[in-house]
């Protein structure tokens, strides 16, 4: 009598996560009688996947009707495959007994699971940085298999080269994660810039996944300050203008000081955007020259995005103007927002 053979024709099978995997196994004889069992892995720690005779295995169904006469096909179908199902599966013939005795194993079929990477998540620096500084962006994607993966960084469509990428774990695993860091040198024009992390994987069929971050979250463009005096008005009032230009973000507080004393404080709000994404703001102060004996030192103090205040001062020459008794030092708040 010929010795029983357990035939697993495929050395390996690759399946997309969520699909069903078919693991083929046939035996060469009905004799000796006894169950076929499927295991993942070999040795004492192997995991029982299916036993036709005993137990319930809701995810596993036999491919052929095992109750059919002369059935020698013990192939199984495992539904809803996840990366955790990866491994080598063995079809094992047992001789009926109390307990059943292992007789022969198939050569094994390695099941690999193709799992899509998760959508890349890009995170930027915790604090804003100014132009000419370098900031780091990180991109993370998880749960993919096989391990081979490509990750690229782009800034405004141009590929970045200052990149460090790691795929973990280094050894064999059911699924993998990728983490990449890109270093970007900021320019004043980057308010509207965007970095893109692009992940390509065999499971994506040439349609890479992208994660984005806006540099507007990472950049601070400090303002330029300019204080100027308009020509004297007929009522002896001088209009002094503080022009705050090309700043980002909008969070800005402006304080006028007259001879070191706070005259007025304003907060920027609802400013129109420049083409490059920055903002401008103009504030003015009316100074009644006739109310002062001495020259008036006006200071425009700007606190931008929580940074130390920046000052710009201007002296109004009182000696050049005739004096009037009893007039107010400063006019009402007539500051306006200008582009």
């Amino acid at each position: 009598e010929e010795e029983l053979q357990v035939i697993q024709p495929e050395k390996s099978v690759s399946v997309a996560a969520g699909d069903s995997a078919t693991l083929n196994c046939t035996v060469s004889s009905l004799i000796p009688v006894g169950p076929i069992q499927w295991f993942r892995g070999a040795g004492p720690g192997r995991e029982l996947i299916y036993n036709l005779k005993e137990g319930h295995f809701p995810r596993v169904t036999p491919v052929s009707d095992p109750t059919k006469r002369n059935n020698m096909d013990f192939s199984i179908r495992i539904s809803n495959i996840t990366p955790a199902d990866a491994g080598t599966y063995y079809c094992v013939k047992f001789r009926k007994g109390s307990p059943d005795v292992e007789l022969k194993s198939g050569a094994g079929t390695e099941l690999s699971v193709r799992a899509k990477p998760s959508a890349p998540v890009v995170s930027g620096p915790a604090v804003r940085a100014t132009a000419e500084h370098t900031v780091s962006f990180t991109c993370e994607s998880h749960g993919f298999s096989p391990r081979d993966i490509t990750l690229k960084w782009f800034k405004n469509g141009n590929e970045l080269s200052d990149v460090q990428t790691n795929v973990d774990p280094a050894g064999k695993s059911v699924s993998y994660s990728i983490r990449s860091t890109a270093r970007v040198v900021l320019t004043r024009r980057d308010v509207h810039s965007q970095v893109i992390c692009e992940v390509a994987h065999v499971t994506l069929q040439g349609d890479p996944l992208r994660g984005t971050a806006n540099l507007s979250e990472a950049i601070r463009v400090p303002p330029f300050l300019e204080v100027t005096q308009q020509s004297m008005r007929a009522d002896n009032q001088v209009n002094v203008t503080c022009q705050v230009t090309k700043f980002y973000p909008q969070r800005l507080q402006l304080t006028w000081l007259e001879n070191g004393n706070v005259s007025r404080t304003e907060m920027a709000s609802a400013l129109p955007e420049n083409k490059d994404g920055t903002y401008n703001w103009t504030s003015w102060l009316l100074v009644n020259v006739s109310a002062h004996r001495d020259d008036v030192k006006l200071t425009c103090q700007v606190e931008h995005d929580g940074q130390p205040a920046v000052n710009k001062s201007f002296s109004v020459k009182v000696s050049a103007h005739p004096k009037e008794q009893g007039s107010n030092t400063a006019a009402e708040n007539t500051g306006t927002n200008e582009r």
């Epitope: 009905l30 004799i31 009688v33 036709l52 005779k53 005993e54 137990g55 319930h56 009707d65 095992p66 109750t67 059919k68 006469r69 002369n70 059935n71 009926k96």
Partner: antibody, heavy 121, light 111 residues
Framework: EVKLEESGGGLMQPGGSMKLSCVAS????????MNWVRQSPEKGLEWVAE??????????HYAESVKGRFTISRDDSKSSVYLQMNNLRAEDTGIYYC????????????WGQGTTLTVSS | DIVLTQSPASLAVSLGQRATISCRAS??????????MYWYQQKPGQPPKLLIY???NLESGVPARFSGSGSGTDFTLNIHPVEEEDAATYYC?????????FGGGTKLEIK
């Protein structure tokens, strides 16, 4: 340990009805075909009925002598198989065995101890 | 239906000798190279116990002194050497087709 325990036998009059029960333990009942076989001095061992698995749509088969009178059924949740016997005849007298079919081929590897049915007026 | 005829109806064999029981089917019980014949032993007050499956294969836990052979329509159960505990009635049964049928039995007595 595989165990099959029959119950429900007794003395019945011809034309009467009776239901035999068999409770199984020690194995995954729902994965096995189950059978009833009876034995009498006159007829020897006689296969009566078979019920297959849920995956076989609980297909049933009967000996010609009981067809239309006997009904085999199973309740996998209770690991039980039943034999409903109607219109009983004297020749239905015997020991009724509940049997597990190991390999879907009338491979009768485990038998219960049997329950006795006597049909007599 | 396939009729199974067993012979002899009874036999007496000396301890240590060979007992041979025959079972003839009215129609072949062989398909696809397999012989769908089974042998059982029954002692008084007990249910039958499976000895041999598919004509020639020893059921788990059955002593090796029991053996089966045959194909098609003619099958044989051999017991050698016979022991005292082998005194029983032996039945053949087929599963070649529905309905499954049993032979009439052979009563073995040990001398």
């Amino acid at each position: 340990e595989v165990k099959l325990e029959e119950s429900g036998g007794g003395l019945m009059q011809p034309g009467g009805s009776m239901k035999l029960s068999c409770v199984a333990s020690g194995f995954t009942f729902s994965n096995y075909w189950m059978n009833w076989v009876r034995q009498s001095p006159e007829k020897g061992l006689e296969w009566v009925a078979e019920i297959r698995l849920k995956s076989n749509n609980y297909a049933t088969h009967y000996a010609e002598s009981v067809k239309g009178r006997f009904t085999i059924s199973r309740d996998d949740s209770k690991s039980s198989v039943y034999l409903q016997m109607n219109n009983l005849r004297a020749e239905d007298t015997g020991i009724y065995y509940c049997i597990r079919d190991y390999d879907y081929d009338a491979y009768f590897d485990y038998w219960g101890q049997g329950t006795t049915l006597t049909v007599s007026s | 239906d396939i009729v199974l005829t067993q012979s002899p109806a009874s036999l007496a064999v000396s301890l240590g000798q060979r007992a041979t029981i025959s079972c003839r089917a009215s129609k072949s019980v062989s398909t696809s190279g397999y012989n769908y014949m089974y042998w059982y032993q029954q002692k008084p007050g007990q249910p039958p116990k499976l000895l041999i499956y598919l004509a020639s294969n020893l059921e788990s836990g059955v002593p090796a002194r029991f053996s089966g052979s045959g194909s098609g329509t003619d099958f044989t159960l051999n017991i050698h050497p016979v022991e005292e505990e082998d005194a029983a009635t032996y039945y053949c049964q087929h599963s070649g087709e529905l309905p499954y049928t049993f032979g009439g039995g052979t009563k073995l007595e040990i001398k």
